[in-house]
């Protein structure tokens, strides 16, 4: 059933989520900047076709439109999306030594955000009985593919986070 902003989500949870989204956006921007500065991979739109051939997926947030938000479905999609990005970021491991710490921080923050969402789902009795399982992740055959993949994953993640932020801000409105 659709659920407006006056939902059962505690304000403290929503504020924590908003902070975590902002932090991950900063991490993602740092990764994009370093990929641009180091490898001149600055325009994700130029790599879209490669993204298709590599099989880099998008995470949907179809249960989250503010007009007809389904709380359980939306939280579940948020969690599943973060779970997907954890796998994609993991697949980028070894992208380059200079990007290692940035990628590590991004992975940790995405995992933490997924945990925050899951904790709240458990508290509300909305947690699904089964954890989402990791689907097949793209296999990067070369260093270039991995770096290009990094640009695309970071770009997809930023889009996902922008929608997440709008949804959470909408829910946080009194």
């Amino acid at each position: 059933t659709p659920l407006g902003p006056a939902s059962s989500l505690p304000q403290s949870f929503l504020l924590k989520c908003l902070e975590q989204v902002r932090k991950i956006q900063g991490d993602g921007a740092a990764l994009q900047e370093k990929l641009c500065a180091t490898y001149k991979l600055c325009h994700p739109e130029e790599l879209v076709l490669l993204g298709h051939s590599l099989g880099i997926p998008w995470a949907p947030l179809s249960s989250c439109p503010s007009q007809a938000l389904q709380l359980a479905g939306c939280l579940s999609q948020l969690h599943s999306g973060l779970f997907l990005y954890q796998g994609l970021l993991q697949a980028l491991e070894g992208i380059s030594p200079e990007l290692g710490p940035t990628l590590d921080t991004l992975q940790l923050d995405v995992a933490d955000f997924a945990t925050t969402i899951w904790q709240q789902m458990e508290e509300l009795g909305m947690a699904p009985a089964l954890q989402p399982t990791q689907g097949a992740m793209p296999a990067f055959a070369s260093a270039f593919q991995r770096r290009a993949g990094g640009v695309l994953v970071a770009s997809h993640l930023q889009s996902f986070l922008e929608v997440s932020y709008r949804v959470l801000r909408h829910l946080a409105q009194p």
Partner: antibody, heavy 119, light 107 residues
Framework: EMQLVQSGAEARKPGSSVKVSCKAS????????ISWLRQTPGQGLEWMGW????????IYAQKFQGRVTMTRDTPITTAYMELSTLRSEDTAVYYC????????????WGQGTMVTVSS | DIQMTQSPFSLSASVGDRVTITCRAS??????LNWYQHKPGKAPKLFIY???SLQSGVPSRFSGSGSGTDFALTISSLQPEDFATYYC?????????FGQGTKVEIK
């Protein structure tokens, strides 16, 4: 009650390896990362790395890269940390902890495992 | 790596005293700072997270403050069970790093 129970104290010779286990209970194991930390007399508390129990993905601190391996056995909700090529400076108390130390802080700790490296 | 510097290294205080321990990060870490209490032979315990949030079960005489690079842990009225070593830890970037610890001893 949420708890992490670690394996017992170990004594090793320089150049050998040690594997410490950490059994989790009282919470959903796959939903929280497990970090490994150590306390040496000279270095204070050091974060060694983190494992995602769901995917098995790991992040290691640069200092331990190449010597540390973190694994997990999800059905028995247990995480493991193996440290190889031991030297006397690795003599320390090793802890597992729930969380990454970021937005999810180290909120549940194991009791610690003393590892002594000596010839 | 982000360096965390605590001061003082140790302090002697009496029961009932107000005690403040400071922690400085080598670069901005927003509010991603945690404080732990550690007693000999025991595992460390989380006391404060997100710079100022009190972990459940921790007495209200403990408080945390700060943002950016400068942080503090304050014990408003020191109790016998508070004598321990306190560590700050940054959770802003990888690798996670700790301060060197502040030992609070009985005067």
């Amino acid at each position: 009650e949420m708890q992490l129970v670690q394996s017992g104290a170990e004594a090793r010779k320089p150049g050998s390896s040690v594997k410490v286990s950490c059994k989790a209970s009282g919470y959903t194991f796959t939903n929280y990362g497990i970090s490994w930390l150590r306390q040496t007399p000279g270095q204070g508390l050091e974060w060694m790395g983190w494992i995602n129990p769901n995917s098995g993905g790991t992040i290691y601190a640069q200092k331990f890269q190449g010597r540390v391996t973190m694994t997990r056995d999800t059905p028995i909700t247990t995480a493991y940390m193996e440290l190889s090529t031991l030297r006397s400076e690795d003599t320390a108390v090793y802890y597992c902890s729930r969380g990454s130390g970021g937005a999810v802080p180290f909120d549940v700790w194991g009791q610690g495992t003393m590892v002594t490296v000596s010839s | 790596d982000i360096q965390m510097t605590q001061s003082p290294f140790s302090l002697s205080a009496s029961v009932g005293d107000r005690v403040t321990i400071t922690c400085r990060a080598s670069q901005t870490i927003s509010n991603r700072l945690n404080w732990y209490q550690h007693k000999p032979g025991k595992a460390p315990k989380l006391f404060i997270y997100y710079a100022s949030s009190l972990q459940s079960g921790v007495p209200s005489r403990f408080s945390g403050s700060g943002s950016g690079t400068d942080f503090a842990l304050t014990i408003s009225s020191l109790q016998p069970e508070d004598f321990a070593t306190y560590y700050c830890q940054q959770g802003y970037s990888s690798p996670r790093t700790f301060g060197q610890g502040t030992k609070v001893e009985i005067k």
